[in-house]
């Protein structure tokens, strides 16, 4: 079944942008001017998920790349990774659970909770130039709030 998708950029609540750091990692840092062109463009898709009143299930792919953010156990810890997929089959309505994030929107701020690992969120560090990761705490030092901007192509 076809899915609704959009193209967007994400910035954390400290206005750090997300950029590629090697082939399979994202990092967060402050960008200005022409450097803004480095930021990753996501293809966010509306997918099937658990019934909820306030969470909207989405998948986060990298635009025009066959890479999706996914959540897996590594050394017994929930971990965020970029995973290659067959572009002929993605995005799809019924994404595997590791690709699904529950988008929680409060006062124009977005959180992305792992569907596979409840209460684990896409997170950035306070420090500059650090990897984007899956964090198990909200409201602490690490940042779990993002803003979204559509990208005009």
């Amino acid at each position: 079944a076809p899915v609704r998708s959009l193209n967007c950029t994400l910035r954390d609540s400290q206005q750090k942008s997300l950029v590629m750091s090697g082939p399979y990692e994202l990092k967060a840092l402050h960008l200005q001017g022409q450097d803004m062109e480095q930021q990753v463009v996501f293809s966010m898709s509306f997918v099937q998920g658990e019934e909820s009143n306030d969470k909207i299930p989405v998948a986060l792919g990298l635009k025009e790349k066959n890479l999706y953010l996914s959540c897996v156990l590594k050394d017994d810890k929930p971990t965020l990774q970029l995973e290659s997929v067959d572009p002929k089959n993605y995005p799809k309505k019924k994404m595997e659970k590791r690709f699904v994030f529950n988008k929680i929107e409060i006062n124009n701020k977005l959180e992305f909770e792992s569907a596979q690992f409840p209460n684990w969120y896409i997170s950035t560090s306070q420090a500059e130039n650090m990897p984007v990761f899956l964090g198990g705490t909200k409201g602490g030092q690490d940042i779990t709030d993002f803003t979204m901007q559509f990208v005009s192509s």
């Epitope: 509306f46 124009n108 559509f150």
Partner: antibody
């Protein structure tokens, strides 16, 4: 305060074209999706389509081909281009804001603009 | 495309009555359903989303329930301001977003 104001409606001949506008304030088109919905006289609501970014638009099957949604974020304006108009396109046309990305529901509406297709 | 069917099409009731409007989807849409109220010459107003969550500022006499393909809108005690047309809307089943045909609530 969220406000949406449609304009551009009027009388058009069958086969003609018309472009409707929806100017918004109190929020940005760079982070909210927008739909067009119409209502023929004495009839129910009919969804036309939705726009996210400029490249991501989705339409009701009946609207594909004749109706095109676009926007100019710098002008806070949404558009509906309607071509090959027919008598059955006579309706009040509303623009509406999606409450949250992919929520599908609409929490802000314009007052509507009337389109009459007649010779 | 998913088709939304409301019943009844028209409903006569009195102030103080308990009113129930139903909406059926042609296939399962989980809880991706909204309800709107529309008065003549006005824009629709969002009442309920995700089948059961009350939109901001909506009186608590309105409630929604259901999941899958069967949904209901209930007005527990009808007030004079509630006479209007009510629409259900599929918000999440596939790419399209579809409304029901509407239920007109009139004074008995």
């Amino acid at each position: 305060e969220v406000q949406l104001v449609e304009s551009g409606g009027g009388l058009v001949q069958p086969g003609g074209s018309l472009r409707l506008s929806c100017t918004v304030s109190g929020f940005s088109l760079s982070s909210y999706a927008m739909s067009w919905v119409r209502q023929a006289p004495g009839k129910g609501l009919e969804w036309i389509g939705i726009i996210y970014d400029s490249a991501s638009t989705y339409y009701a099957s009946w609207a594909k081909g004749r109706f095109t949604i676009s926007k100019d974020t710098s002008k806070n304006t949404l558009y509906l281009q309607m071509n090959s108009l027919r008598a059955e396109d006579t309706a009040v046309y509303f623009c509406a804001r999606e409450r949250q990305i992919f929520s599908g529901d609409m929490d802000g509406w314009g007052q509507g603009t009337t389109v009459t297709v007649s010779s | 495309e998913i088709v939304m069917t409301q019943s009844p099409s028209t409903l006569s009731a009195s102030v103080g009555d308990r009113v129930i409007i139903t909406c059926q989807a042609s296939q399962s849409i989980d809880n991706w359903l909204s309800w709107y109220q529309q008065k003549p010459g006005k824009a629709p107003k969002l009442l309920i989303y995700r089948a059961s969550t009350l939109a901001s500022g909506v009186p608590s006499r309105f409630s929604g329930s259901g999941s899958g393909a069967e949904f209901t809108l209930t007005i527990s005690s009808l007030q004079p301001d509630d006479f209007a047309t009510y629409y259900c809307q599929n918000t999440g089943g596939g790419v399209s977003i579809a409304f029901g045909q509407g239920t007109k609530l009139t004074v008995k």
